[in-house]
Interface confidence: low
């Protein structure tokens, strides 16, 4: 017979059978590396019922409560459920050295409360290596060419890159996810795309590269129809 | 009060309140592009619980039920619960004209039978553009260098992409996953390590790309140390 | 560049039997479907069979089924045909074919191999 | 197994000359059909695949073209190379079949 039979009022209705879920966020890596930037740890809360909308955060750094978390204002989602955020700011230098951040969820809707812990990646921090590959000539016949930035070897995965011309950010640029490599390091692309004549006229391009095994946590590289000729 | 006060005989135990799930797993790319391969759509029936471990399957193709799916022996997990998988073989042809694939679920652990569907990516197919980038000349200073593949323009994106030389397999390469482009389209890059004193034999490197857009499904572009000097 | 090269000739024994390779070269062995057509003396051209080096599957044609066994060594990239009770009705030019570069219609016997030329004599 | 009437089995042309062969399927067969060329000395190449598309590297004096379950390889005008051996292959079920075969002959 089925787990379900008439529902007693103890249950749920079928469709919020799991209660909430929690889901906890790293800050970005480019904030974590800038001292003119935030980094925030960001503690998610979906699928809270109507019924029992309060929700209760608490957040511990290596085990010890802090207050200075900032909890937005709980959003109603398409499914009639609610969607709570807490943002918790972080030193940058507490991240990079590996402190742990623990957000606590309580409601109504939960038999207990649930801790979900975030962390840097564990293990030795290894540089990246930056390398700029000019357009194939065999897209030199299309209107747009694509200028390549490799970056590998590096470890953890978080890093940031950007790309910029003649002192100006160039934003038509896409970066793959980090993939690991054979030897537990990562590697990333990110490919600028940029006009051909722009290219051809022998403007300078630089890929900026941004991770905390860095000198300065920061490197560029660059990359011209001259350069390297 | 909360909603799990008591929990009464005909609800689950708190862990498995949402009984079991249902994931539905496309064919692999380079399967539904080569004759020589087995295309095939796998239903993940997860979360099973040990008093009620016995699911059946349905499988339905643009709606017409269809008998020759394999069900594999259920695997019990960690967490005490069983693992179930149906494997349904299917038409290169059929998949790539878009056929949709329905796996139905049932199981006394389910208010009601859950179903997944599944079809390729709906659009019209858009033909890669492949281009081989050499080792840039920072990197020559190690002794393994970077070839590089990038591939641009596709949709949709299962794609499947391999290096050789010589006729045998490179096996020493890693693939971005596809990047969705600012044109709808998207891209990737393939990475080819390979002993620095390979590469300046003059040794020649292939990358060989798999995509339903190809004619022939398929194409295959060169690089080595002399071509295009 | 794709190239199938084909044993050399035969002169064999009736009752006998006889295997013949194909070796294949230019392009990744296990990723394509190698099939074997048989054309005797001043006749067309017919189907044997097929094997799949990805996973050694293989289909005959009904006639040949107990006649040809199709094998395949990856490490070499080369793909066997042996035929076995050989009688005169078996001499014949064997030709290995590869499919082409993909899944459809274009797949089938893009390349083929300069043939292996068996004669089956006493 | 699905039957391919080719014909003529002999032809006798001139240089220059346009001709065309012909296959007929006993059954449907769709578009899965190949066209191969096989010299004198044994080697065969295709040339057509598909009924129409062309093998890359065959001259376009080379077409391939389908009505209802006619197919037919036409050559829009013969060079010394072309009098040779040519067969029909049909792949829409197996096994595969081919066609007798047609001798182009220099008249």
């Known amino acids: 017979e089925s787990k379900y039979g008439p529902p007693c009022p103890s249950c749920p209705a079928p469709e919020f059978l799991g209660g909430p879920s929690v889901f906890l966020f790293p800050p970005k890596p480019k904030d974590t590396l800038m001292i003119s930037r935030t980094p925030e740890v960001t503690c998610v809360v979906v699928d809270v019922s109507q019924e029992d909308p309060e929700v209760q955060f608490n957040w511990y750094v290596d085990g010890v409560e802090v207050h200075n978390a900032k909890t937005k204002p709980r959003e109603e989602q398409f499914n009639s459920t609610y969607r709570v955020v807490s943002v918790l700011t972080v030193l940058h230098q507490d991240w990079l050295n590996g402190k742990e951040y623990k957000c606590k969820v309580s409601n109504k809707g939960l038999p207990s409360s649930i801790e979900k812990t975030i962390s840097k990646a564990k293990g030795q921090p290894r540089e990246p290596q930056v390398y700029t590959l000019p357009p194939s000539q065999e897209e030199m016949t299309k209107n747009q060419v694509s200028l390549t930035c490799l970056v590998k070897g590096f470890y953890p995965s978080d890093i940031a890159v950007e790309w910029e011309s003649n002192g100006q950010p160039e934003n038509n640029y896409k970066t793959t996810p980090p993939v690991l490599d054979s030897d537990g390091s990562f590697f990333l692309y990110s490919r600028l795309t940029v006009d051909k004549s722009r290219w051809q006229e022998g403007n300078v391009f630089s890929c900026s590269v941004m991770h905390e095994a860095l000198h300065n946590h920061y490197t560029q590289k660059s990359l011209s129809l001259s350069l390297g000729k | 009060e909360s909603k799990y006060g008591p929990p009464c005989p005909s609800c689950p135990a708190p862990e498995f309140l949402g009984g079991p799930s249902v994931f539905l797993f496309p064919p692999k790319p380079k399967d539904t592009l080569m004759i020589s391969r087995t295309p095939e759509v796998t239903c993940v029936v997860v979360d099973v619980s040990q008093e009620d471990p016995e699911v059946q399957f349905n499988w339905y193709v643009d709606g017409v039920e269809v008998h020759n799916a394999k069900t594999k022996p259920r695997e019990e997990q960690f967490n005490s619960t069983y693992r179930v998988v149906s494997v349904l073989t299917v038409l290169h042809q059929d998949w790539l004209n878009g056929k949709e694939y329905k796996c139905k679920v049932s199981n006394k652990g389910l208010p009601s039978s859950i179903e997944k569907t599944i079809s390729k990516a709906k659009g019209q197919p858009r033909e890669p553009q492949v281009y081989t980038l050499p080792p840039s000349q920072e990197e020559m200073t190690k002794n393994q260098v970077s070839l590089t593949c990038l591939v641009k323009g596709f949709y949709p994106s299962d794609i499947a992409v391999e290096w050789e030389s010589n006729g045998q397999p490179e096996n020493n390469y890693k693939t971005t996953p596809p990047v969705l482009d600012s044109d709808g389209s998207f891209f990737l890059y393939s990475r080819l390590t390979v002993d620095k004193s390979r590469w300046q034999e003059g040794n020649v490197f292939s990358c060989s790309v798999m995509h339903e857009a190809l004619h022939n499904h398929y194409t295959q572009k060169s690089l080595s140390l002399s071509l295009g000097k | 560049e794709v190239q199938l090269q084909q044993s050399g000739p035969e002169l064999v024994k009736p009752g006998t039997s006889v295997k013949m390779s194909c070796k294949a070269s230019g392009y990744i062995f296990t990723s394509y479907i190698l099939h074997w057509v048989k054309q005797k003396p001043g006749q067309g051209l017919e189907w044997i069979a097929y094997?799949?080096?990805?996973?050694?599957?293989?289909k005959y044609k009904e006639k040949f089924k107990g006649k040809g066994t199709l094998t395949s060594d990856k490490s070499s990239s080369t793909a066997y045909m042996e035929l076995s009770s050989l009688t005169s009705e078996d001499s014949a030019v064997y030709y290995c074919?590869?499919?082409?570069?993909?899944?459809?219609?274009?797949?089938?016997?893009?390349?083929w191999g300069p043939g292996t030329l068996v004669t089956v004599s006493t | 197994d699905i039957q391919m009437t080719q014909s003529p089995s002999s032809l006798s042309a001139s240089l220059g000359e346009r001709v065309s062969l012909t296959c007929r399927a006993s059954q449907d067969i769709g578009s899965s059909l190949n066209w191969l060329q096989q010299e004198p000395d044994g080697t065969i190449k295709r040339l057509i695949y598909a009924t129409s598309s062309l093998d890359s590297g065959v001259p376009k004096r080379f077409s391939g073209s389908r009505s209802g379950s006619d197919y037919s390889l036409t050559i829009s005008s013969l060079e010394s190379e072309d009098f040779v051996d040519y067969y029909c292959l049909q792949y829409a079920s197996y096994p595969p079949t081919f066609g007798a075969g047609t001798k182009l002959e220099l008249k």
């Open positions: 074919a590869r499919s082409g570069g993909g899944y459809g219609n274009y797949a089938w016997f893009a390349y």
């Open positions: 094997i799949n080096p990805y996973n050694d599957g293989t």
